[in-house]
Amino acid sequence: LTCLGGFASPGPVPPSTALRELIEELVNITQNQKAPLCNGSMVWSINLTAGMYCAALESLINVSGCSAIEKTQRMLSGFCPHKVSAGQFSSLHVRDTKIEVAQFVKDLLLHLKKLFREGQFN
């Protein structure tokens, strides 16, 4: 089972408030995107597995001066048990693949949605 901010998935329970807010922020970013997100900045792709929150933060923290994802960065830090600083990398990064921040956010959102639906949809 994948631990998702305080509950196990699959399972018939909705997310914690903090995780719900993260999902909503990712939705806001993807739906309200007008110009290229973070000026088209590229970040390391990650393996969307058990430690994905820390890995996502480690990837996104290297993007500076982008107000659109600052809230997401703060939220992700709440799900990562250790302090993350720029330039830090874990084994969860796909080090040979860089993608745009917009795609990174979309992939993360899609993965979270899949995780929640797993417990409810057959």
Partner: antibody, heavy 119, light 107 residues
Framework: QVQLVQSGADVKKPGASVKVSCKAS????????IHWVRQAPGQGLEWMGA????????AYNQKFKGRATLTADKSTSTAYMELRSLRSDDTAVYYC????????????WGQGTLVTVSS | EIVLTQSPATLSLSPGERATLSCRAS??????LHWYQQKPGQAPRLLIY???QSISGIPARFSGSGSGTDFTLTISSLEPEDFAVYYC?????????LGGGTKVEIK
């Protein structure tokens, strides 16, 4: 703007099947679940089930399991609800509605499709 | 299955009066409760989500409160167009369930 447009009213005989369509527009179809809710004349709202158009995964109200089938066609952004072995008490208005994730609210609704089951 | 019980079944009030609608869940659903309004011949319309969150385009006279098992929809001052049936919905877990509705009628 977001729209869910349903097929027209239908009259069926007991024991027959009905298939109601729901065409989505104004948003990315695979980003939202499609849920089906029905309302018998003068009665309240009853949730029937849901489909994730991206994967085809479904969830059903136990009451309709085995009798209802939910499908979605990504190429046409259309969801379908088929109900078999119709009875007179299946006479109702059937609504499709979208939900981002199951715990979200139903923010947009189709106009409803009246299905009348009568001999 | 989470059962939602709405009360009263019918509320007879005059325009300008305050309407208080109740919805009680059979078990704790946190704030995963949504409210809808339905007028005759129309599809339901979302009013309030997550128990108290307002929807853009919905008049400020509609407000929601509560958490756990007890929830309230309040219409601060009834307008003629507010006379309708109101439903609460459980968003906590499948099967999604709805209350039996409260009809707000003109006194």
């Amino acid at each position: 703007q977001v729209q869910l447009v349903q097929s027209g009213a239908d009259v069926k005989k007991p024991g027959a099947s009905v298939k109601v369509s729901c065409k989505a527009s104004g948003y990315t179809f695979i980003d939202y679940e499609i849920h089906w809710v029905r309302q018998a004349p003068g009665q309240g709202l009853e949730w029937m089930g849901a489909i994730d158009p991206e994967t085809g995964g479904t969830a059903y109200n136990q009451k309709f399991k085995g009798r209802a089938t939910l499908t979605a066609d990504k190429s046409t952004s259309t969801a379908y609800m088929e109900l078999r072995s119709l009875r007179s008490d299946d006479t109702a208005v059937y609504y499709c509605t979208r939900i981002l994730l199951y715990y979200y609210p139903m923010d947009y609704w189709g106009q409803g499709t009246l299905v009348t089951v009568s001999s | 299955e989470i059962v939602l019980t709405q009360s009263p079944a019918t509320l007879s009030l005059s325009p300008g009066e305050r309407a208080t609608l109740s919805c009680r869940a059979s078990q704790n659903i946190s704030d995963y409760l949504h409210w809808y309004q339905q007028k005759p011949g129309q599809a339901p319309r979302l009013l309030i989500y997550y128990a108290s969150q307002s929807i853009s385009g919905i008049p400020a006279r509609f407000s929601g409160s509560g958490s756990g098992t007890d929830f309230t929809l309040t219409i601060s001052s009834l307008e003629p167009e507010d006379f309708a049936v109101y439903y609460c919905q459980n968003g906590h877990s499948f099967p999604l369930t709805l209350g039996g509705g409260t009809k707000v009628e003109i006194k």
